[in-house]
Interface confidence: low
């Protein structure tokens, strides 16, 4: 049997015997263009493809379409994995989205949404959740149904405001949403009423601004 | 019975100025988003500015930056439009409105109720503003 060299995600990665966490390249679907992910192969049964880590503010999410489109930052710390790409992985299979979240006492909770995509570039890389389960919060904190994305140069939210330049970074804004895991990052004793901080809302509440954050992606045929 | 009375409007000369307020009752408004809106003959309503409950941030549409200035008074539980440097183009019915929702337990901006039209559900009956050149 042929060994499969390129591979579309973190499960794959994982069920060809690779099952050490740390970063892997990515191959876009019917494509030869890659891309450099993390892959957690620890939590929950492993193949975890992350798409979203934040842990201490070296990196600025301030960005731009493009860039939120490209990804940026390190895989091994802060970073940005892509819209294009995650939305081109997650048309072709059903993927699930686990969010991690850590607060600054030590507390640490999730939100796992059984089924999650998100549409092309020209619906604005739409957000699409169903099947909300785990403990930061009964209530998605990110809006139902999916909003667009929206960053500081592309204003695709349902205020009048512009909720990533009053909010800081690219998210699926409403108007302006109970989350935003792409805002400022506050250092410990400052993260209270923080309007543009680390948004979870139906967590921690109003202005609190969040220690770490993940977002991770795993085919829901796992 | 939450109820939302405007006043203030009427009819200005160009580059003129006029304060519109928002009177509450029902509710304390303090706790609670309240969104300027205004609807020109055969336009849609457009948000102007709001103010969100709890910590006075406030926002405004780009074609009134500057010119306009929303404030709060929760002593009369009122919000205010103080609009200068009117032009022909602000010439419409102006309305405010909030959220029934509220979020009184903190700022309804940071729940996501901020400025959205579609997040409003309780309206005054509005204040004609006419500005001719």
């Known amino acids: 049997k042929e060994e499969q060299t390129t591979f579309r995600d973190c499960a794959e990665i994982f069920k060809s015997g690779l099952t050490t966490s740390g970063i892997y390249t990515l191959t876009f679907p019917n494509s030869t263009e890659e891309i450099k992910a993390y892959c957690d192969m620890d939590v929950g049964g492993g193949g975890w493809t992350v798409i979203q880590h934040r842990e201490d503010g070296s990196v600025d999410f301030q960005r731009t379409w493009k860039e939120y489109k490209e990804g940026f930052g390190s895989p091994l710390g802060e970073y940005w994995l892509g819209n294009e790409f995650v939305s081109q992985l997650t048309g072709q299979h059903r993927y699930v989205l686990k969010i991690q979240l850590k607060d600054w006492e030590g507390n640490e909770a999730h939100s796992l949404y059984d089924h999650f995509y998100l549409a092309g570039e020209e619906s604005n890389y739409r957000i699409h959740l169903t099947g909300l389960t785990g403990t930061a919060g009964k209530i998605s904190s990110i809006s139902q149904p999916g909003s667009d994305f929206s960053t500081k140069d592309s204003d695709n939210d349902k205020c009048i405001c512009k909720c990533s330049q009053m909010l800081s970074g690219g998210w699926w804004f409403d108007a302006c949403g109970p989350s935003n895991l792409n805002g400022q990052y506050y250092p410990q004793k400052q993260n209270t009423n923080k309007f543009n901080g680390i948004k979870w809302y139906y967590w921690k509440g109003s202005g609190y601004s969040l220690k770490a954050t993940t977002m991770m992606i795993r085919p829901a045929d796992f | 019975e939450v109820q939302l009375v405007e006043s203030g409007g009427g009819l200005v000369q160009s580059g003129g100025s006029l304060r519109l307020s928002c009177a509450a009752s029902?509710?304390?408004?303090?706790?609670?988003?309240i969104g300027w809106f205004r609807q020109a003959p055969g336009k849609e309503r457009e948000g102007v500015s709001c103010?969100?409950?709890?910590?006075?941030?406030?926002y405004y549409a780009d074609s009134v930056k500057g010119r306009f200035t929303i404030s709060r008074d929760n002593a009369k539980n009122t919000v205010y439009l103080q609009m200068n440097s009117l032009k022909p183009e602000d010439t419409a019915v102006y309305y405010c409105a909030t959220d029934s929702a509220g979020v009184p337990a903190g700022p309804a901006a940071v729940y996501g109720s901020t400025c959205s039209r579609l997040e409003y559900d309780y309206w005054g009956q509005g204040a004609q503003v006419t500005v001719s050149s």
């Open positions: 103010i969100s409950g709890g910590d006075t941030s406030t």
């Open positions: 029902g509710f304390a408004l303090d706790y609670y988003t």
